[in-house]
Interface confidence: medium
């Protein structure tokens, strides 16, 4: 029998392709800088298939090397405002659990109003992930223009 | 026998491993906001491996969940230029078919020359992808500068 | 037996997932444009699993393509200043052997502080990846600022 | 082979108008942005004005910029410069440059050039 | 705008010698976006270098080009005697496309 036959037999968790990506919802109460995601195939584009959401932020399900990703758009922006309103800084960490609470990626958009990045990074089920948006501007909903995503890559 | 050795014997396109990075090749006509793009080993370091070309634009062959990626540099371009010209925009999207239409990814370049990004999304077989450059500003084809590709991630 | 219970009895190298991120660990001396990288646990979160370290320099292990991917943030840097020392830019490239050497991947900082991009490339073992980033001004170390890393994807 | 053949240059008094063509041959016109480049005797050459293989992006220089203007007929193979409201400062010999592709680097191909004298 | 400072503005050699050009920005030229012209009297500009380094069809090994930010050289290895000319660069990473005037290499 053919593997790729085979492969459709098993359950996909089983392979571990854990993949998340998410649209952002809203952003948090003041003082709280954490961006609040969503997924799922009723919002448009965005899916959850492992990780789950917790409150808003991704949690882990599944130890290994992850691919990270996040794109963020300044929702009124334009070179001026952006380095006016300087320094607007996104970073993406491990929040909890508290024990390996660590940032993995961070930028700042200096006179652009929008940042791209992506890294890979070990995690391990448990982690949630949070994304930090600090300054006085607000990301942009679109769904093309802001989203965060994460994609296991091997054990 | 291993699984490794298996693989093997398999062809790849059975394992779901569709896989395409393209290399510029012009842009469209007047009014045609389209990048049209080319592909394969004879252009470079460029391939298709399951997708294919349709008339310089994307075409999936195979339904999945795929990392989409794509840097665009401008080819006469210093902050200076590209805020004059502002806005120039990029935007990747399902182009064909029309029911399926819609904006992938989307990034202006403000006072920067180069926008790189990356999501994960869901694309299904016969899906075309566009890559819309509006403004007056064009690309560089530099092969370092300029690219666009996808990589099936899972079913 | 499940495929999942066989895929850990196999030593994933066999299954070709050659994967590494590093952090930075030092620029080069003076005229030598060339960034030096280093990775591994006792580091924090880098890694290499199959590709190697030579001199600070990142070489392939396995012929396949690559995902690779990149962010470079300056280390005293507002847009400012970016834009007085303007161009400082970024490639990545096959540096050894000779005979392969080419440019991947680059860009410009312009009136922005970090680049950070990705592509798909065809790699082969022993090809050794150097990132060169000219220019007066100099690199974060901070490893969620600054990293570099691949990605096996398929034969 | 490619070939830039100018044309319509000579003559013509201060704050008077000219029009150059370019006929083009050897190459796939459209595909490719153009430019006209000019050398006044004994100086350097200046980038005057660029234009997209559609037509559809013109860029000038700032000396010429709101004076002249580049335009295309891609069915006719040829590329035009309208000067207006000459100057002496715009004599010089006037090259059809060929871009090396569509999105404006480096010149590979020129032609021969055709001498505007602006002069009362 | 870069402007572009090409020197020596002249330069007296032989044939077989070897010639170093050199072209100056006054700002960095992007990602080696720099180019090298020959030009004959009553001759268009001709097409030497490209990228700062590559090599147009057709040119001889004999041209070579190196630099980048804002120091580029032309190097002619071994002068033949149809070498003698004028070399200008230019710069096409941003508008407006600016030329150095020239080096004039004349045979000694």
């Known amino acids: 029998q053919r593997f790729a036959q085979a492969q459709q037999q098993l359950p996909l968790e089983s392979l571990g392709w854990d993949v998340a990506e998410l649209q952002l919802n809203h952003t948090g109460p003041q003082q709280d800088p954490r961006l609040y995601w969503q997924g799922g195939p009723a919002l448009g584009r965005s899916f959850l298939h492992g990780p789950e959401l917790d409150k808003g932020q991704l949690r882990i399900h599944r130890d290994g090397i992850y691919m990270v990703h996040i794109q963020v758009t300044l929702a009124i922006c334009s070179s001026t405002t952006a380095s006016r309103h300087h320094p607007t800084t996104l970073a993406v960490g491990i929040c909890s659990p508290a024990s390996r609470s660590i940032s993995l990626l961070r930028l700042s958009f200096h006179q652009g109003c929008t940042i791209a990045s992506q890294r890979l990074t070990p995690l391990a089920r448990g982690d949630t992930l949070c994304t930090n948006l600090t300054g006085t501007l607000l990301p942009s909903r679109n769904t093309d223009e802001t989203f965060f995503g994460v994609q296991w890559v091997r054990p | 026998q291993r699984f490794a050795q298996a693989q093997q014997q398999l062809p790849l396109e059975s394992l779901g491993w569709d896989v395409a990075e393209l290399q510029l090749n012009h842009t469209g006509p007047q009014q045609d906001p389209r990048l049209y793009w080319q592909g394969g080993p004879a252009l470079g370091r460029s391939f298709l491996h399951g997708p294919e070309l349709d008339k310089g634009q994307l075409r999936i062959h195979r339904d999945g969940i795929y990392m989409v990626h794509i840097q665009v540099t401008l080819a006469i371009c210093s902050s200076t230029t590209a805020s004059r010209h502002h806005p120039t925009t990029l935007a990747v999207g399902i182009c064909s078919p029309a029911s399926r239409s819609i904006s992938l990814l989307r990034l202006s370049f403000h006072q920067g020359c180069t926008i790189a990004s990356q999501r994960l999304t869901p694309l299904a077989r016969g899906d075309t992808l566009c890559t819309n450059l509006t403004g007056t500003l064009l690309p560089s084809r530099n092969t370092d500068e300029t690219f666009f590709g996808v990589q099936w991630v899972r079913p | 037996q499940r495929f999942a219970q066989a895929q850990q009895q196999l030593p994933l190298e066999s299954l070709g997932w050659d994967v590494a991120e590093l952090q930075l660990n030092h620029t080069g001396p003076q005229q030598d444009p060339r960034l030096y990288w280093q990775g591994g646990p006792a580091l924090g979160r880098s890694f290499l699993h199959g590709p190697e370290l030579d001199k600070g320099q990142l070489r392939i292990h396995r012929d396949g393509i690559y995902m690779v991917h990149i962010q470079v943030t300056l280390a005293i840097c507002s847009s400012t200043t970016a834009s007085r020392h303007h161009p400082t830019t970024l490639a990545v490239g096959i540096c050894s052997p000779a005979s392969r050497s080419i440019s991947l991947l680059r860009l410009s900082f312009h009136q922005g502080c970090t680049i950070a991009s990705q592509r798909l490339t065809p790699l082969a073992r022993g090809d050794t990846l150097c990132t060169n980033l000219t220019g007066t001004l100099l690199p974060s170390r901070n490893t969620d600022e600054t990293f570099f890393g691949v990605q096996w994807v398929r034969p | 082979e490619v070939q830039l053949l100018e044309s319509g240059g000579g003559m013509v008094q201060p704050g008077g108008s000219l029009r150059l063509s370019c006929a083009a041959s050897?190459?796939?016109?459209?595909?490719?942005?153009m430019s006209w480049v000019r050398q006044a005797p004994g100086k350097c050459l200046e980038w005057v004005s660029a234009?997209?293989?559609?037509?559809?992006?013109?860029f000038y220089a700032e000396s010429v910029e709101g004076r002249f203007t580049i335009s295309r007929d891609n069915s006719k193979n040829t590329l035009y410069l309208q000067m207006n409201s000459l100057r002496a400062e715009d004599t010089a010999v006037y090259y059809c440059?060929?871009?090396?592709?569509?999105?404006?680097?480096?010149?590979?191909?020129w032609g021969q050039g055709t001498l505007v004298t602006v002069s009362s | 705008e870069i402007v572009l400072t090409q020197s020596p503005g002249t330069l007296s050699l032989s044939p077989g010698e070897r010639a170093t050009l050199s072209c100056r920005a006054s700002q960095s030229v992007r990602s080696t976006y720099l180019a090298w012209y020959q030009q004959k009297p009553g001759q268009a500009p001709r097409l030497l270098i490209y990228g700062a380094s590559s090599r147009a069809t057709g040119i001889p090994d004999r041209f070579s080009g190196s630099g980048s930010g804002t120091d580029f050289t032309l190097t002619i290895s071994r002068l033949e005697p149809e070498d003698f000319a004028v070399y200008s660069c230019q710069q096409y990473g941003d508008l407006p496309f600016t030329f150095g005037c020239g080096t004039k290499l004349e045979i000694k």
């Open positions: 234009i997209s293989g559609s037509g559809g992006r013109t």
């Open positions: 440059a060929k871009h090396d592709y569509s999105n404006y680097p480096y010149f590979d191909y």
């Open positions: 050897g190459f796939t016109f459209s595909t490719y942005a």
